[in-house]
């Protein structure tokens, strides 16, 4: 089990590092987006795992951004985010495979309404229970 957890961490960290770099290979990214969305978590250790991903980064002082799958919809009344988060999530759930371009990548400020827990604990718990 420890080996499995290590392998999972390595895969996730690699997925985060390479997020958005290859529009033809988005299966791992979309799977991880789905995990974050479902487990209500962000990043592996912490949301800050995402801050090195250049494609998500804002300019200057607004650098810290995370994927929209980290957005905590229940913590906000902001309906505009529904179009950006919920609909893409639903299309992925329906396996509507399509190549994604960097312009399609949805990011939100990490200081807003996001999940502040990393996903490691939730996934480890899930592994222990299965």
């Amino acid at each position: 089990r420890a080996q499995l957890e290590r392998s999972l961490r390595d895969v996730v960290e690699k997925t985060i590092q390479k997020y958005g770099t290859n529009p033809e290979e988005t299966a791992a990214e979309e799977s991880w987006d789905y995990v974050q969305f479902q487990l209500r978590c962000c990043g592996w250790h912490y949301p800050q795992d995402w801050f090195q991903v250049l494609i998500l980064r804002g300019n200057g002082s607004e650098a810290h951004r995370v994927p929209c799958s980290c957005y905590n919809l229940s913590a906000t009344n902001d309906s505009t985010i529904l179009d950006k988060v919920i609909l893409p999530q639903l299309s992925r759930l329906g396996h509507l495979a399509r190549s994604r371009h960097s312009a399609d990548i949805c990011a939100v400020p990490a200081e807003s309404h996001i999940y502040r827990e990393g996903c490691a604990q939730g996934l480890q718990k899930w592994l222990h229970n299965n």
Epitope: Q48, Q52, H64, P109, E111, H113, R116
Partner: antibody, heavy 115, light 107 residues
Framework: QVQVKESGPGLVAPSQSLSITCTVS????????VSWVRQPPGKGLEWLGV???????NYHSALKSRLSIKKDHSKSQVFLKLNSLQTDDTATYYC?????????WGQGTLVTVSA | DIQMTQSPASLSVSVGETVTITCRAS??????LAWYQQKQGKSPQLLVN???NLADGVPSRFSGSGSGTQYSLKINSLQSEDFGTYYC?????????FGGGTKLEIK
């Protein structure tokens, strides 16, 4: 443009509580974090805590038991409360826009803890 | 909590010189690091975040580098307005800390 301004009591007696208000403009408290930092006279910076856009907080682990940060969106204000003050809590207290890196700082308010 | 160790504590340099200030974290902070400049009697100002990303309006003579536990701030061709105290700050985990500061004085 972004503005951040602290207002505090100046002098507080030992064992009493400190309350400081940070009034902000030029950005929304729903999408930005606001942090608190203090600096004792002639010393370095000490991070105290942050309140995020969703109202959740992170606190300095050694101060967690006597520190609280809250906010009022309608007034664009963030509040710091520090209980059971001692003389070593004497410092300039700053609030700043930003939860991770702190992009805009207030001018600070000097708080002296003395009988 | 993660400790941040800055060095040197102070240095005396001339205008036009290049200086490097370093910051060591007690554990891997994965580039979640900011640098600030503070002048006497003033509030700190953000220079760099995410270890290498220059904040808005910061001159290009400033640059940040590093990864893991070791980070540095380099100032090329020092100007008179660059003198003051510099602080690093990490934001990995759930509680942040500042380094002890580096006082940059005019020679």
């Amino acid at each position: 443009q972004v503005q951040v301004k602290e207002s505090g009591p100046g002098l507080v007696a030992p064992s009493q509580s400190l309350s400081i208000t940070c009034t902000v403009s030029g950005f929304s408290l729903t999408t930005s974090g606001v942090s608190w930092v203090r600096q004792p006279p002639g010393k370095g910076l000490e991070w105290l805590g942050v309140i995020w856009g969703d109202g959740s907080t992170n606190y300095h682990s050694a101060l967690k038991s006597r520190l609280s940060i809250k906010k009022d969106h309608s007034k664009s204000q963030v509040f710091l409360k520090l209980n059971s003050l001692q003389t070593d809590d004497t410092a300039t207290y700053y609030c700043a826009k930003g939860g991770y890196s702190l992009a805009h700082w207030g001018q600070g308010t000097l708080v002296t803890v003395s009988a | 909590d993660i400790q941040m160790t800055q060095s040197p504590a102070s240095l005396s340099v001339s205008v036009g010189e290049t200086v490097t200030i370093t910051c060591r974290a007690s554990e891997n902070i994965r580039s979640n690091l900011a640098w600030y400049q503070q002048k006497q009697g003033k509030s700190p100002q953000l220079l760099v975040n995410v270890a290498t990303n220059l904040a808005d309006g910061v001159p290009s003579r400033f640059s940040g580098s590093g990864s893991g536990t070791q980070y540095s701030l380099k100032i090329n061709s020092l100007q008179s307005e660059d003198f003051g105290t510099y602080y690093c700050q990490h934001y990995w985990g759930t509680t942040w800390t500042f380094g002890g500061g580096t006082k940059l004085e005019i020679k």
